[in-house]
Interface confidence: low
Amino acid sequence: YDFTNCDFEKIKAAYLSTISKDLITYMSGTKSTEFNNTVSCSNRPHCLTEIQSLTFNPTAGCASLAKEMFAMKTKAALAIWCPGYSETQINATQAMKKARKSKVTTNKCLEQVSQLQGLWRRFNRPLLKQQ
């Protein structure tokens, strides 16, 4: 999906008002210095590409993020403010349904959400200092 057509300011507002708080809630009890940020992004469309990938694509050791509150709100924001985004997510939704129903917060998931927090912060001030 080409995220260059999204309404970035509206997505930013959604992040600041709710998604950021849900990410903090998910990470509660974890030290902010526990994980190093290894994923970065250079422009807001690029940031959204990375955010979508980390939020909705199951990874080894963390298959359940898509059902979290921050993920559902992220999906809603992208669906509302990125034209045509919903249509591209039909296959992704099917994959999400196959994901395990129980929410398991593994260390790998915590690390992944820590990366997401960094990506969202970069989304708000996105210019990569050095490619």
Epitope: T4, S42, N43, P126, Q131
Partner: antibody
Framework: EVQLVQSGAEVKKPGASVKVSCKAS????????MHWVRQAPGQGLEWMGM????????TLIQKFKDRVTMTVDKSTSTAYMELSSLRSEDTAVYYC??????????WGQGTTVTVSS | DIQMTQSPSSLSASVGDRVTITCRAS??????LAWYQQKPGKAPKLLIY???TLAEGVPSRFSGSVSGTDFTLTISSLQPEDFATYYC?????????FGGGTKVEIK
């Protein structure tokens, strides 16, 4: 209204330094990066580097690394670009421009720097 | 560094003409390209960013498109105020680089 107002024209001798200022208004200074671009007479645009006003981190292209210093004064929302060891080929119009995603939505009016003995 | 090759370097056209300027990137920059218009003695003015998004206040006769690493700026019907020099610039990552410029002159 967003404005970037630059300092006036300068005439300098070879080997001297020049410091160009760029005063920002109409937006939150620390939210946007400030870039500097120069244009020699009759030539195209050349990117020099950028500074992040929130933490003063700078990125400069290799050719300017030894001669350019970029700074900001957050209290006055002003960015500065100092170019040292001036030579005749530094004669150009110097622009500041703000950016969030890498394209420049607002530019300063330009500062003409003439290097002549 | 990413090189931006802009063509033509100059062109002559009449009011009402359709004008096309192209810019080729030396590597994939996706949609991270901006177009600017510059008039003598003035700072450049943003026309288009993300290859095809029109900047605020820019007339709809300006449009941008992308095909791979080739980018196009089109002026559908040239107006007297459009005679100027146009630059492309990639905004994919540092160092930012500009094309050499295209001067649009009156025929």
């Amino acid at each position: 209204e967003v404005q970037l107002v630059q300092s006036g024209a300068e005439v300098k001798k070879p080997g001297a330094s020049v410091k160009v200022s760029c005063k920002a208004s109409g937006y939150t200074f620390t939210t946007y990066w400030m870039h500097w671009v120069r244009q020699a007479p009759g030539q195209g645009l050349e990117w020099m580097g950028m500074i992040d006003p929130s933490d003063s981190e700078t990125t400069l292209i290799q050719k300017f690394k030894d001669r350019v210093t970029m700074t900001v004064d957050k209290s006055t929302s002003t960015a500065y670009m100092e170019l040292s060891s001036l030579r005749s080929e530094d004669t150009a119009v110097y622009y500041c421009a703000r950016t969030l995603d890498g394209y420049y939505d607002y530019w300063g009016q330009g500062t003409t720097v003439t290097v002549s003995s | 560094d990413i090189q931006m090759t802009q063509s033509p370097s100059s062109l002559s056209a009449s009011v009402g003409d359709r004008v096309t300027i192209t810019c080729r990137a030396s590597e994939n920059i996706y949609s991270y390209l901006a177009w600017y218009q510059q008039k003598p003695g003035k700072a450049p003015k943003l026309l288009i960013y993300f290859a095809k998004t029109l900047a605020e206040g820019v007339p709809s006769r300006f449009s941008g498109s992308v095909s791979g690493t080739d980018f196009t700026l089109t002026i559908s019907s040239l107006q007297p105020e459009d005679f100027a020099t146009y630059y492309c610039q990639h905004h994919y990552g540092t160092p930012w680089t500009f094309g050499g410029g295209t001067k649009v002159e009156i025929k």
